[in-house]
Interface confidence: low
Amino acid sequence: HNTTVFQGVAGQSLQVSCPYDSMKHWGRRKAWCRQLGEKGPCQRVVSTHNLWLLSFLRRWNGSTAITDDTLGGTLTITLRNLQPHDAGLYQCQSLHGSEADTLRKVLVEVLADPLDHRDAGDLWFPGESESFEDAHVEHSISRSLLEGEIPFPPTS
């Protein structure tokens, strides 16, 4: 899996989207987990509703929310009041039994100074946020991690 970078501004909300094949993952609950170190386990942060039919309902764990558009095939995670310690590598997962398939690897970057990215909105397509109920959510910037880039800095 390639890693997709999502950048957000400290103190604001960041929305992460994980597209998936709605046919293949039909009937499966989803989860958002945080990778603990390069080779470490992925620690569950929040998962979708226990009843798959209610996956569209937003579930919160602290400042992190998850909602699943099972027809369209998009899992959306909202990180509210983004803080520097939220930066790191995460995964969107599809759950089946005791197994979990990785839908997307995500590197969250937290930008300290919003003025440095005041033109970031030019990169966003407003229509993409229309189905979400949080009107205050800030638009995120995402890109794929370039070949050779590493999500974890080398340890000295």
């Epitope: 709605s22 046919m23 293949k24 039909w26 039919l53 099972t70 027809l71 369209g72 095939g73 398939d101």
Partner: antibody, heavy 123, light 112 residues
Framework: QVQLVQSGAEVKKPGSSVKVSCKAS????????MNWVRQAPGQGLEWMGR????????NYAQKFQGRVTITADESTSTAYMELSSLRSEDTAVYYC????????????????WGQGTLVTVSS | DVVMTQTPLSLSVTPGQPASISCRSS???????????LHWYLQKPGQSPQLLIY???NRFSGVPDRFSGSGSGTDFTLKISRVEAEDVGVYYC?????????FGQGTKLEIK
Amino acid sequence: QVQLVQSGAEVKKPGSSVKVSCKASGYAFSSSWMNWVRQAPGQGLEWMGRIYPGDGDTNYAQKFQGRVTITADESTSTAYMELSSLRSEDTAVYYCARLLRNQPGESYAMDYWGQGTLVTVSS
Amino acid sequence: DVVMTQTPLSLSVTPGQPASISCRSSQSLVHSNGYTYLHWYLQKPGQSPQLLIYKVSNRFSGVPDRFSGSGSGTDFTLKISRVEAEDVGVYYCSQSTRVPYTFGQGTKLEIK
């Protein structure tokens, strides 16, 4: 148009293995489940298993677990079904069949079938 | 596994007359997503099976409108309003709500 073309008939000895191929064309091979179904002479249809070529995810019927292996080669859009430890009861026509995909999530019916491959197990 | 039971196992019909095949499953075929994955296939003599009806009542492309499917839960029916000579073959109901997918024993339709 969608086409599934299977390999030719095989005659095998009991205890041996057979590998049947199914070459797909006319659709996105990687993102549709491919099934294998068999039909013994004069009998009904029996589902053996399926594969999602996009990532190799497989499910098998309990009856064939441990004896059947379904694989897929995305580069050639070809699915394979290998059945080992053959016995005379495995004599059948083996079909590959794609799962229907129209609206998102409205799937799980086999809309296109290969022409079938007759496997005869005889000493 | 879900057991699919078809009745009758054979049917002899005069052209132009209706025909009906029943299919019963050993457990409900309603998926957790609300859909019911019950399908009907026809296998004509010497041919591969072909899809007729998917998800209880949806005719597959190219299937004549004389074919219709109905039912819910565990009881389903395939109806042919006016049988034609080309309809001969073996009809199978099948479920894909649960893995492993299973088929009925088949109903052989003959023309009188």
